[in-house]
Structure formats: structure tokens, C-alpha cells
């Protein structure tokens, strides 16, 4: 039975041209995390394999950085980066857990800076 839960940063906002950290945390399970995939709606952004490390998609190589931890840093944000992001935890023996984050990239300095994992 899958007992784990994923905590995420939830709905966050950031300014165009800035950076943001996407962060998820899997809790309430003893399952072993084998891999975390980060996806943006239709696209695979990055993979963090527990044994092998990180790979960033060639499509996002210049704007995505691994970490901190199992999180993902998005850089040089554009309004087109607005949308849903998913952290997909592959675990053994539980299976797959998915967390959702909604990022809104704002044109000016109206972005809220209260998000816990946001880069100033």
C-alpha cells in the first residue's frame, strides 16, 4: 500500500528574467527513492537518479540547473515558463508518487516573494 505523501511549494510566482527553485519532498514512507523526474506539462526537464546522478534534458540544458537536493532550479525565466510542473518520484516498493507545482512568471516586480524555496 502506498502510504507516502508529497509536499511541494504549491503555487509560486517569480519575475521574468529571474530564477526559481522547484522543490518537492516525499514523506510518510520508508520506500527507497530510485529516481525523480521533473516534468513541465508535456516536457521532461531533468532526471535525478539515486545511483547515477543528474541528467538535464538537452532541450533545457542552458536554463535548468540540478538541485538543491532533489529540487530543480529554473533560470532566465520567461512568461512562457508559466504553467504546471511535476516532480515524479519513482520508489521501491511503493511505485510512483507525483507532486504538482504551479509557477506563474510575472512581467514586472509584482511577483510575490513569500514562497519558501524562492531565490530572492
Amino acid at each position: 500500500m502506498m502510504t507516502g505523501t508529497i509536499e511541494t511549494t504549491g503555487n509560486i510566482s517569480a519575475e521574468k528574467g529571474g530564477s526559481i527553485i522547484l522543490q518537492c519532498h516525499l514523506s510518510s514512507t520508508t520506500a527507497q527513492v530510485t529516481q525523480v523526474n521533473w516534468e513541465q506539462q508535456d516536457q521532461l526537464l531533468a532526471i535525478c537518479n539515486a545511483d547515477l546522478g543528474w541528467h538535464i534534458s538537452p532541450s533545457f540544458k542552458d536554463r535548468v540547473a540540478p538541485g538543491p537536493g532533489l529540487g530543480l532550479t529554473l533560470q532566465s525565466l520567461t512568461v512562457n515558463d508559466t504553467g504546471e510542473y511535476f516532480c515524479i518520484y519513482h520508489t521501491y516498493p511503493d511505485g510512483t508518487y507525483t507532486g504538482r507545482i504551479f509557477l506563474e512568471v510575472l512581467e514586472s516586480s509584482v511577483a510575490e516573494h513569500g514562497a519558501r524555496f524562492q531565490i530572492p
Epitope: 529516481q35 506539462q41 508535456d42 516536457q43 521532461l44 532526471i47 537518479n49 547515477l52 546522478g53 541528467h55 534534458s57 538537452p58 532541450s59 540544458k61 519513482h90
Partner: antibody, heavy 119, light 107 residues
Framework: EVQLVESGGGLVQPGGSLRLSCATS????????MYWIRQAPGKGLEWVAY????????YYPDSVKGRFTISRDNAKNTLYLQMNSLRAEDTAVYYC????????????WGQGTLVTVSS | EIVMTQSPATLSVSPGERATLSCKAS??????VAWYQQKPGQAPRLLIY???ARHTGIPARFSGSGSGTEFTLTISSLQSEDFAVYYC?????????FGGGTKVEIK
């Protein structure tokens, strides 16, 4: 059993068009990113196109950009490659391939379909 | 474009011997390298990904190593079914590129 079966190849004149299909089975097609790869006779492998699992984004090398279009129909479990303005150098066996779900590599390939561009 | 250069072009080895295939990238690709095996008339088969991880079902005699710009595929004891062409591929950046291949033939 995972299967990918290409079709649509054949002989076409320079400047002509062709549409390749790749029928898939044995896996949930809509959960996977897909590729087209080609191999000219007696030569090495060349990446031709990449499409995200929902079909929202596509990527191509400069050699085919603007001439080739990759698309997919997730309801039909089928991948397509529309090839226009074909040139002699496009002559090759065209393979469709599935991206692994743990990396950006290709774990299952079809057997290929031969495209010959000649007058 | 990242150029992947494989050497040697042809490697003649006796069954049971060790084969070492080289692949060099024109710029740093980290560990974003895969190795494929192709036999005549067949599609390529994934052997190694992430430079050193064996794909499901690939025998332990196949091993990959390297990072940055230099990579190696080692077949510890060649079996008759291992005689084929081997390609390396980088997936660090677009365009995705393959090496020219190394043909492993029976000595």
C-alpha cells in the same frame, strides 16, 4: 511485448514528399517521448526528430528542419514523420524509437523502413 | 554540434578475448553517453546509458566507463553473438549525435 512497426517508405523523386508511420503496441504510447533516427546505406546513425509525449514540442537537426515534421496520434498509438522537399541525401532506413523512461536514450526500435530519393 | 569520434573503425578480436572501444566527444558531455549494438539487417540495441549503466537484460560482460570527453565500452570476453557494429551517442545537447561506429569482427 513492446513493438514498433514502421511503414510508408519507398521510392520518391527529389523534391517529393513521403509520410512515414510507426504503429506501436505493448506499452502506453502516450507516456513516452519518441524519436525518428535514420541510417544511410552503409553509414552510421543520424537523429532526425524528437517529440514530447503529448506532442506539444518537437526538435530537429538543421539538416531536416523546415522540411520534416514529426507528429503523433496518441489515440491511435502511432508516430508519424512527414517528409517534404526530399533530397538524394535523405535516402536511408528510417527507424522510430522509444525513449526510455529513466533517461534520454532509446530503448526500443522498430525494424526500419527504407526511403529512396532518386530520379 | 558535438562530434563523437570512435576508434578504431574496425577491431579484429578472437572469441573469448577482451575488446576495448573508444569514443571521444568534441566537448564536455558529462556522462550523457549511450552505447548501442547493431547487427546486419537489424535495428540498434541499447547496451549502456548514463555512460556506465547497463540496460535491462544486457550481459555483465558489457561495461561502460568515462565522463567528460572520453568514453570506453569494454566487452570482457567476446562471444560469437557480440560481433557487430557499436555506436556511441551523446544526449547532452541538441543535435543528438552518434559516433561513426566501430565494427568488431572475428580475428
Amino acid at each position: 511485448e513492446v513493438q514498433l512497426v514502421e511503414s510508408g517508405g519507398g521510392l520518391v523523386q527529389p523534391g517529393g514528399s513521403l509520410r512515414l508511420s510507426c504503429a506501436t503496441s505493448g506499452f502506453t504510447f502516450s507516456d513516452y517521448y519518441m524519436y525518428w533516427i535514420r541510417q544511410a546505406p552503409g553509414k552510421g546513425l543520424e537523429w532526425v526528430a524528437y517529440i514530447t509525449k503529448g506532442g506539444g514540442s518537437t526538435y530537429y537537426p538543421d539538416s531536416v528542419k523546415g522540411r520534416f515534421t514529426i507528429s503523433r496520434d496518441n489515440a491511435k498509438n502511432t508516430l508519424y514523420l512527414q517528409m517534404n522537399s526530399l533530397r538524394a541525401e535523405d535516402t536511408a532506413v528510417y527507424y522510430c524509437a522509444r525513449q526510455t523512461n529513466y533517461d534520454f536514450t532509446m530503448d526500443y526500435w522498430g525494424q526500419g523502413t527504407l526511403v529512396t530519393v532518386s530520379s | 554540434e558535438i562530434v563523437m569520434t570512435q576508434s578504431p573503425a574496425t577491431l579484429s578480436v578472437s572469441p573469448g578475448e577482451r575488446a576495448t572501444l573508444s569514443c571521444k566527444a568534441s566537448q564536455d558531455v558529462g556522462t550523457s553517453v549511450a552505447w548501442y549494438q547493431q547487427k546486419p539487417g537489424q535495428a540498434p540495441r541499447l547496451l549502456i546509458y548514463w555512460a556506465s549503466a547497463r540496460h535491462t537484460g544486457i550481459p555483465a560482460r558489457f561495461s561502460g566507463s568515462g565522463s567528460g570527453t572520453e568514453f570506453t565500452l569494454t566487452i570482457s570476453s567476446l562471444q560469437s553473438e557480440d560481433f557487430a557494429v557499436y555506436y556511441c551517442q551523446q544526449y547532452s545537447s541538441y543535435p543528438l549525435t552518434f559516433g561513426g561506429g566501430t565494427k568488431v569482427e572475428i580475428k
